[in-house]
């Protein structure tokens, strides 16, 4: 499995998970692939406490999270239920805005500079956060 007993170097432990904060930028799909190659996934935000932790470590930067509606409904990359889970959208979001002129709407979610979420064009290059579970049982 992908669970670990301690976090890898340069990863930050919080509440049973390990987090890695990028310093470069990538489109959502490339960020998602990067996390998978690290046996992790784009961060799944499940609580206000986790949201606050992430904000403290990210700084005020647009940062991809593991939430997308590229397949229709909004879904977290690890299968966590979107409908019943924590949500922290900016007011008026998500809006699937077409006005950017790049074709299509907006299908990937990111932290904005104030930490609340926005949907944006998935191919925009933003920072990202990877997350993997920490196995405390071993």
């Amino acid at each position: 499995g992908s669970e670990r007993t301690c976090c890898p170097i340069n990863w930050v432990e919080y509440e049973g998970s390990c987090y890695w904060f990028s310093s470069s930028v990538r489109p959502w799909t490339e960020a998602d692939k990067y996390c998978q190659l690290e046996n992790a996934h784009l961060v799944v935000v499940t609580s206000r406490d986790e949201q606050n932790f992430l904000q403290r470590h990210m700084g005020p930067l647009n940062t991809w999270i593991g939430l997308t509606d590229q397949n229709g409904p909004w879904k977290w990359v690890d299968g966590t239920d979107y409908e019943t889970g924590f949500q922290n959208w900016r007011p008026e979001q998500p809006d699937n805005w077409y006005g950017h002129g790049l074709g299509g709407g907006e299908d990937c979610a990111h932290f904005t500079t104030d930490g609340r979420w926005n949907d944006d064009v998935c191919r925009r290059p933003y920072r990202w956060v990877c997350e993997t579970k920490l196995d405390k049982a071993n």
Partner: antibody
């Protein structure tokens, strides 16, 4: 289960008005763009209007612009289409559907609007 | 506005046949092309989104391809329940537009 149910269709005279409703259930309604699509008897599909999750962005087909108004009430999980100055060519089955750039899914069962004197 | 055309407008086929329907956009829509199936008296059903992604629950005999202006829907082995009308739709930009449809009936 994700479900959309339209209502409000019926027979109306030319120049009259009608308000269609679409009741949504089984998903976080405010997170999704919603749409109206119509189909005249024996004809193909025609996109009518779209509205973003928070009503920030609204779009209309030229054929209905200035006559139809799309709106939503996220507290009631409902989508509406106010149709004014109706014409014979507006006769169609009207469908509501969820979604945007990744296609419309699901669709409601449709409600028939007949404009005739 | 982006115009969508489909060919053929109708076709007759037998169970087991391989069926191909084409859709053309009047300008590039990159991959923002969706395919729907509609049976008489029913609402349309999403089959393929963004040109080639199979909608959840749709049989794998349906596939889509193409990008830019030219797109194809293929049914690898036609089944009795596949006799219906098929529509393409662009979701690249507003106003969204549908193709005129292709009716697939029994030979």
């Amino acid at each position: 289960e994700v479900q959309l149910v339209e209502s409000g269709g019926g027979l109306v005279k030319p120049g009259g008005s009608l308000r269609l409703s679409c009741a949504a259930s089984g998903f976080t309604f405010s997170s999704y763009s919603m749409n109206w699509v119509r189909q005249a008897p024996g004809k193909g599909l025609e996109w009518v209007s779209s509205i973003s999750g928070s009503s920030s962005y609204i779009y209309y087909a030229d054929s209905v612009k200035g006559r139809f108004t799309i709106s939503r009430d996220n507290a009631k999980n409902s989508l509406y289409l106010q149709m004014n100055s109706l014409r014979a060519e507006d006769t169609a089955v009207y469908f509501c559907a969820r979604g945007g750039s990744r296609g419309f899914d699901p669709w409601g069962q449709g409600t028939l609007v007949t404009v005739s004197s | 506005d982006i115009q969508m055309t489909q060919s053929p407008s109708s076709l007759s086929a037998s169970v087991g046949d391989r069926v191909t329907i084409t859709c053309r956009a009047s300008q590039s829509i990159t991959s923002y092309l969706n395919w729907y199936q509609q049976k008489p008296g029913k609402a349309p059903k999403l089959l393929i989104y963004t040109a080639s992604s199979l909608q959840s629950g749709v049989p794998s005999r349906f596939s889509g391809s193409g990008s830019g202006t030219d797109f194809t829907l293929t049914i690898s082995s036609l089944q009795p329940e596949d006799f219906a009308t098929y529509y393409c739709q662009q979701s690249h930009s507003f106003p969204f537009t549908f193709g005129p449809g292709t009716k697939v009936d029994i030979k």
